[in-house]
């Protein structure tokens, strides 16, 4: 269930906001990747 987020707090697919502050932690996207020449390559 890949969801890509704008910095605004919107999710691209359905524009659902993180409305309640208590949900901030559970809606942070984890970034797992390898830095190669200044570019992050997803692993």
């Amino acid at each position: 269930d890949a969801e890509f987020r704008h910095d605004s707090g919107y999710e691209v697919h359905h524009q659902k906001l993180v409305f309640f502050a208590e949900d901030v932690g559970s809606n942070k996207g984890a970034i797992i990747g390898l830095m190669v020449g200044g570019v992050v390559i997803a692993c």
């Epitope: 359905h14 659902k16 309640f20 208590e22 949900d23």
Partner: antibody
Framework: EVQLVESGGGLVQPGGSLRLSCAAS????????MSWVRQAPGKGLELVAQ????????YYPDTVKGRFTISRDNAKNTLYLQMNSLRAEDTAVYYC?????WGQGTLVTVSS | DVVMTQSPLSLPVTLGQPASISCRSS???????????LHWFLQKPGQSPRLLIY???NRFSGVPDRFSGSGSGTDFTLKISRVEAEDVGVYYC?????????FGQGTKVEIK
Amino acid sequence: EVQLVESGGGLVQPGGSLRLSCAASGFTFSRYSMSWVRQAPGKGLELVAQINSVGTSTYYPDTVKGRFTISRDNAKNTLYLQMNSLRAEDTAVYYCASGDYWGQGTLVTVSS
Amino acid sequence: DVVMTQSPLSLPVTLGQPASISCRSSQSLIYSDGNAYLHWFLQKPGQSPRLLIYKVSNRFSGVPDRFSGSGSGTDFTLKISRVEAEDVGVYYCSQSTHVPWTFGQGTKVEIK
């Protein structure tokens, strides 16, 4: 498209019970806190229950504490409100809300 | 609970003229992430509330740019640059920084 659809409202006698349901779609339901908000005729918005994303924490105002129970089934993308020992003053339109999105509301009328 | 106080409670407006609603919270709405979770809703007669402005100053999807929000800490303002006929209804400020979610009393905007 985000949608919240309530059901289960109706006419009930004082002291009776009702169970409201809210079917959610268009977003990852399990990641978001949800609430039930009511509005008595001609009045403002009143939160009656709030539940966190995983269902481990709930909040009720004193007006409904001990009588109402909020729960959720994240596998079914559904929010519930069990209402017991209903009183005339519980008469209102009940909305399911994720904050940014609200359902159409379901009318609960408590009367003999 | 965080108490939200709106003023005025009734606002007669002239079409094409600006309008402003104030909202004050009983405690700071700044969350640990640096954001204030202060929002504005509009409820038109017979409809569910709909989100206009989220996190103080961000217009929600589809909201006209004549609506703007500002403020910080405990004092916030909603402004309509030029009121249109479709803007009539009850405006609510709301905070979701702290549990429980709380609402202002509502400001009824009507055309003079």
